[in-house]
């Protein structure tokens, strides 16, 4: 139920990457505004994005308090200019979001190859440890800090002259791989959380190739 000139929000969708988390919904408002509430399963509702005409609300500040909790949000619809108005049941129209557990569901952001260094027939490839918006003791945690050994990286590497992608894996942010002497290689990395059943993989990092600035070559 609700007032005749408001419609309930629908298609409530969580959009989350590396814990930056936004709730999106439809429709674009016509003569109405929205307020969002969020809570954990056992917690109290907290209001965010008061009387907004947007169809999204950044809930990052709330979910980073405990990324392993499961959250529920709801979007209230109010008539524009008359936000005290309620539906026939005595409360404004609202719609619930799906449940969202950040630790299990946030998308893994595109990783970046920080550097690579060749020493003889070995190459050390280092992946940048991306900062998240999750805090502990007033400092922002990295992706590795949050996920620990649950997070692995897959390295794809190939000779510049060929197409077949060899793979290596690490549960740190570094790879040490064997390469053929005198060959140039290209690299791309992918973040993976194997324990998940969905959203297990990130998109691939930009490709970096030997002979470009990021790398360092030392003949031993």
């Amino acid at each position: 139920s609700g007032t005749t000139n408001t419609v309930a929000a629908y298609n409530l969708t969580w959009k989350s990457t590396n814990f930056k988390t936004i709730l999106e919904w439809e429709p674009k408002p016509v003569n109405q505004v929205y307020t969002v509430q969020i809570s954990t399963k056992s917690g109290d509702w907290k209001s965010k994005c008061f009387y907004t005409t947007d169809t999204e609300c950044d809930l990052t500040d709330e979910i980073v308090k405990d990324v392993k909790q499961t959250y529920l949000a709801r979007v209230f619809s109010y008539p524009a200019g008359n936000v005290e108005s309620t539906g026939s049941a005595g409360e404004p129209l609202y719609e619930n979001s799906p449940e969202f557990t950040p630790y299990l569901e946030t998308n893994l952001g595109q990783p970046t190859i920080q550097s690579f260094e060749q020493v003889g027939t070995k190459v050390n490839v280092t992946v940048e440890d991306e900062r998240t918006l999750v805090r502990r003791n007033n400092t922002f945690l990295s992706l590795r800090d949050v996920f620990g050994k649950d997070l692995i990286y897959t390295l794809y590497y190939w000779k510049s002259s060929s197409s077949g992608k060899k793979t290596a894996k690490t549960n740190t942010n570094e790879f040490l791989i064997d390469v053929d002497k005198g060959e140039n290689y290209c690299f791309s990395v992918q973040a993976v959380i194997p324990s998940r059943t969905v959203n297990r993989k990130s998109t691939d990092s930009p490709v970096e190739c030997m002979g470009q600035e990021k790398g360092e070559f030392r003949e031993i």
Epitope: I152, K165, K166, T167, A168, V192, P194, R200, K201
Partner: antibody, heavy 120, light 107 residues
């Protein structure tokens, strides 16, 4: 329940082509990696190649490089093995298998296999 | 490519026997070794991963161990359903490679 079902095997002449399919259910192939492994009659297991369906990256055993191509149709949740210029020594049961993708666990599920016979 | 040399190629044993199969890697593969069981006409099944971890649902009579580049599969007390062929496989580097297999037959 995780399942992999291969199809498309059969009798083919030397120099001919065949396309095998591997239909997956119970998981989304783009979240994992898919391998093809073969086994000649009375012989051991031989790795053929892999695909990461998420990005299309592949790698092949030297014995099939340039002749076999692995692809994936993520909308159909199916992986494929296109085999060209087939030789008698390619006669085998071909298995597709799921790579769990962790540091520890490698192939955790296998299909039932499909027999490819290359003979004139 | 890394070679996995498996031995013996076959063995005969009785129900209740302790059976040991070994695999030697041609270079360091850390613990990235799995063991599979295959019965005639069937697909292989994962028994052991990461050299020594028992896969879900596999009986505890199966165990794996590592010593350097040597890997061992042990069946502590052979059961009738264990007569099969066993393969080791390294997945430390691409391409992954299998051992030649060990056929465990009834004595």
């Amino acid at each position: 329940e995780v399942q992999l079902v291969e199809s498309g095997g059969g009798l083919v002449q030397p120099g001919g082509s065949l396309r095998l399919s591997c239909a997956a259910s119970g998981f989304t192939i783009s979240d994992y990696w898919i391998h093809w492994v073969r086994q000649a009659p009375g012989k051991g297991l031989e790795w053929v190649g892999y695909i990461d369906p998420y990005n299309g990256y592949t790698y092949y055993a030297d014995s099939v490089k340039g002749r076999f191509t692995i692809s994936a149709g993520t909308s159909k949740n199916t992986a494929y093995l296109q085999m060209n210029s087939l030789r008698a020594e390619d006669t085998a049961v071909y298995y597709c298998a799921r790579d769990y993708g962790s540091l520890q666990v490698f192939i955790d599920y296998w299909g039932q296999g499909t027999l490819v016979t290359v003979s004139s | 490519d890394i070679q996995m040399t498996q031995s013996p190629s076959s063995l005969s044993a009785s129900v209740g026997d302790r059976v040991t199969i070994t695999c030697r890697a041609s270079q360091d593969v850390n613990t990235a070794v799995a063991w599979y069981q295959q019965k005639p006409g069937k697909a292989p099944k994962l028994l052991i991963y990461s050299a020594s971890f028992l896969y879900s649902g596999v009986p505890s009579r199966f165990s794996g161990s590592r010593s350097g580049t040597d890997f061992t599969l042990t069946i502590s007390s052979l059961q009738p359903e264990d007569f099969a062929t066993y393969y080791c496989q390294q997945h430390y580097t691409t391409p992954p490679t299998f051992g030649q297999g060990t056929k465990v037959e009834i004595k």
